[in-house]
């Protein structure tokens, strides 16, 4: 007789999830010498231990502590790039500007990027059929709690000038309900962070409006200022071209008005 299984509203665990996590861990530790000491089997065991046999609406940050400990990593605290609703460009950017880091450039972020996972209460099975949706089911699900935990730690580690890439094509350029707006902004440490510098990425080809004057950016400025952190903002009107110019600043098209 088939066991009754809870049907959640979100997609199920990514297929070949254990193999993917393990393979990513091995690849990452090979590429990053400072993480060569990491035992990837232990990392997978700790990852699995955070959600297997637990109700997928009852996950806590505490569940992820063994994984956090194994994935402890030092990135230059003054070279951190946060992002909101513009992940692909942020990642393209750190591939060019190799001395800056997004969360997904760290081991733990790299392991989980674009993956979904959950288990079931009292069974050691991984649920490949469905997982809880943050809105429709519950917020304390394995994926959401993981990203909340690693995002908080990443923001807490930041110092000096912290950069954030924001999507200027969205109705809310700064969204208080995003991970950046709800977690990272509130976990920047004013005693370490001097300035938050927002880069507003334009979508339209001929869009030369100053999106730094957008009401949601003013709201972000207000939140940051109240936390005794300075705020600055710049428009990136041509992200494709900007990326090229970061890669090759000598290119005459970066400065020539013709």
């Amino acid at each position: 007789v088939p066991r009754w299984r809870q049907q959640w509203s979100g997609p199920g665990t990514t297929k070949r999830f254990p193999e993917t996590v393990l393979a990513r861990c091995v690849k990452y530790t090979e590429i990053h010498p400072e993480m060569r000491h990491v035992d990837c089997q232990s990392v997978w065991d700790a990852f699995k231990g955070a959600f297997i046999s637990k109700h997928p609406c009852n996950i806590t940050e505490e569940d992820y502590q063994p994984l956090m400990k194994l994935g402890t990593q030092t990135v230059p605290c003054n070279k951190i790039l946060l992002w909101s609703r513009i992940k692909d460009l942020a990642h393209q950017f750190t591939q060019v500007q190799r001395d800056m880091f997004t969360l997904e450039d760290t081991l733990l972020g790299y392991l989980a990027d674009d993956l979904t996972w959950c288990g079931e209460f009292n069974t050691s099975k991984i649920n490949y059929q469905s997982c809880p949706d943050w809105r429709k089911d519950c917020s304390n699900n394995p994926v959401s709690v993981f990203w909340k935990t690693v995002s908080r730690r990443f923001a807490e580690a930041a110092c000096d000038v912290v950069h954030v890439m924001l999507n200027g094509s969205r109705s809310k350029i700064f969204d208080k309900n995003s991970t950046f707006g709800s977690v990272e902004v509130h976990n920047l440490q004013p005693e370490k962070v001097q300035t938050l510098e927002a880069w507003v990425i334009h979508g339209g080809r001929e869009d030369s409006r100053d999106l730094c004057q957008d009401p949601t950016i003013k709201e972000l400025e207000s939140i940051i200022s109240k936390r005794n952190i300075q705020f600055s903002c710049k428009n990136i009107y041509r992200p494709d071209k900007f990326l090229q110019c970061v890669k090759n600043p000598e290119d005459s098209s970066c400065t020539s008005e013709i």
Partner: nanobody, 123 residues
Framework: DVQLQASGGGSVQAGGSLRLSCAAS????????MGWFRQEPGKERRFVAS???????TYAESVKGRFTISRDNAKNTMYLQMNNLKPEDTAVYYC?????????????????WGQGTQVTVSS
């Protein structure tokens, strides 16, 4: 707070020279690309020259061979040596700083602007 203080502007005859300075505070100067822009009355601000944190330089075509940009990281200051000045160089000159790269303004704003210094070249 980040501050960029431009100075050294003035009036000069065509063929003369001026040296502009931009003193920076509140930022890790040696990590920043620095640049100069200029704005003629009724026109848009335009790129003049930039110097990267590595020391590499870029110039607008119209000033190549006449202007030299430099920086002194120990003094947190950037300079623009302007020789063989022409009446068409008359403008308000602004310094700028950016963590990454200084581009023309149709691509991206710099992270920080200084206030302007007036340069007037008469024939």
């Amino acid at each position: 707070d980040v501050q960029l203080q431009a100075s050294g502007g003035g009036s000069v005859q065509a063929g003369g020279s001026l040296r502009l300075s931009c003193a920076a505070s509140g930022l890790s100067f040696s990590d920043y690309a620095m640049g100069w822009f200029r704005q003629e009355p009724g026109k848009e601000r335009r790129f003049v020259a930039s110097i990267r944190s590595s020391g590499g330089t870029t110039y607008a075509e119209s000033v190549k061979g006449r202007f030299t940009i430099s920086r002194d990281n120990a003094k947190n200051t950037m300079y623009l040596q302007m020789n063989n000045l022409k009446p068409e160089d008359t403008a308000v000159y602004y310094c700028a700083a950016d963590r990454l790269v200084i581009t023309k303004l149709s691509i991206a704003d710099p992270g920080y602007w200084g206030q302007g210094t007036q340069v007037t070249v008469s024939s």
